[in-house]
Interface confidence: medium
């Protein structure tokens, strides 16, 4: 079955960078876009961006452009999200999630378990 | 960015009774070729979100048929015909028609 397994929780200082990984299994990794979404305490879910693993095409939320980099390692069926210049408001649970087409419609269907990133001095 | 507004924010329900959640978008979510990328998710306490409905009204595999989605353009609705205890959590709508994709603020369904 489809599984997305993310790396463990991270604690970072303001100004630092964090890199979260997401390993996909149970499906053809290169056939589905990988999205990244975050959820800050008490906030709504926020879409960060997406990457097409087959060609590494990316689309980013302008809010994060310049600070976020999405990459993939196809040989390891793993996607990465790196966020730099961290600030306290980046404290959130970060999710990877698969985006796929099915019968003409597109949806983000399967989600990772989430990675808590805490930014604190 | 497209703003997604859900109502109500909190919904106390009695098991066996119906429930309805509204989601409105600040602009039309209809694609030029006819489809609408509007989906619904349930985030149960302590879990990741799970897909319930995509393309306005298509139930994702394994989702009970008590869940149904409807709407068009800017107005969408998620209905639960008979709420069960396992349905508690926060429900989110998501639009994937325009980048950046945006979520509603969530509707918390709790048992009375």
């Amino acid at each position: 079955q489809v599984q997305l397994v993310q790396s463990g929780a991270e604690v970072k200082k303001p100004g630092a960078s964090v890199k979260v990984s997401c390993k996909g299994s149970g499906y053809t990794f290169t056939s589905y876009w990988m999205h990244w979404v975050r959820q800050a305490p008490g906030q709504r879910l926020e879409w960060i961006g997406e990457i097409d693993p087959s060609e590494s095409n990316t689309n980013y939320n302008q809010k994060f452009k310049g600070r976020v980099t999405l990459t993939v390692d196809i040989s390891a069926s793993t996607a990465y999200m790196e966020l730099s210049s961290l600030r306290s408001e980046d404290t959130a649970v970060y999710y990877c999630a698969r985006g796929g087409y099915d019968g003409w419609d597109y949806a983000i269907d399967y989600w990772g378990q989430g990675t808590l990133v805490t930014v604190s001095s | 960015d497209v703003v997604m507004t859900q109502s109500p924010l909190s919904l106390p329900v009695t098991p066996g009774e119906p429930a309805s959640i509204s989601c409105r978008s600040s602009q039309s979510l209809a694609k030029s070729y006819g489809n609408t990328y509007l989906s619904w998710y349930l985030q149960k306490p302590g879990q990741s979100p799970q897909l319930l409905i995509y393309g306005i009204s298509n139930r994702f595999s394994g989702v009970p048929d008590r869940f149904s989605g409807s709407g068009s353009g800017t107005d969408f609705t998620l209905k639960i015909s008979r709420v069960e205890a396992e349905d508690v959590g926060v429900y989110y709508c998501l639009q994937g028609t325009h980048q950046p994709y945006t979520f509603g603020q969530g509707t918390k369904v709790e048992i009375k």
């Epitope: 003409w104 | 070729y33 489809n35």
Partner: antibody
Amino acid sequence: EVQLVESGGDLVKPGGSLKLSCAASGFTFSSYGMSWVRQTPDKRLEWVASISSGGSYTHYPDSVKGRFTISRDNAKNTLYLQMSSLKSEDTAMYYCARHGTGVGFDYWGQGTTLTVSS
Amino acid sequence: DVVMTQTPLTLSVTIGQPASISCKSSQSLLDSDGKTYLNWLLQRPGQSPKRLIYLVSKLDSGVPDRFTGSGSGTDFTLKISRVEAEDLGVYYCWQGTHFPQTFGGGTKLEIK
């Protein structure tokens, strides 16, 4: 394997009506949007109608809007195209096609021929 | 409607040699969701069309990797690295970004 078999094509007079059918097998029909696409005698392809998996949503190009109606019976795994006020320019091979991954038609039937002529 | 213009109309190739077909759209096919809905189909003689490539460059299952799709915006290309006898037929490009979805006029690939 996925199979789509069209039927109902015929010779019809201008202004006449006809209903095409498409029997689907080899996949969960109720999970997929479906379309009708036609190929004119000069081999040009033209999209004619689409319907969502549950049948709630339908779409048509202006060339057939108001004259053609797409429908489906998920219990019978069958897609339909009801055509009325037919014109000579509707003469074509009509294909039913499944909406597949990535938006577009991944599987097509073998086609059924409609000829509109007096 | 978006006009899809394919060139050449006919392409005579030798087995084992490469082939390239161009498809130009009258407006950009980049959608508001960040995707480009451009597909390629092959209609072999006496058969119905079969999709080869979707989303510009993604190969359908079972399609040999000698086929590649590329391009962006309004200019797209289908390449066959080494033509085989089974590749002959008419190739069509298709766009699903704008309503109504439209096809190119076709490129007939024949063996020299």
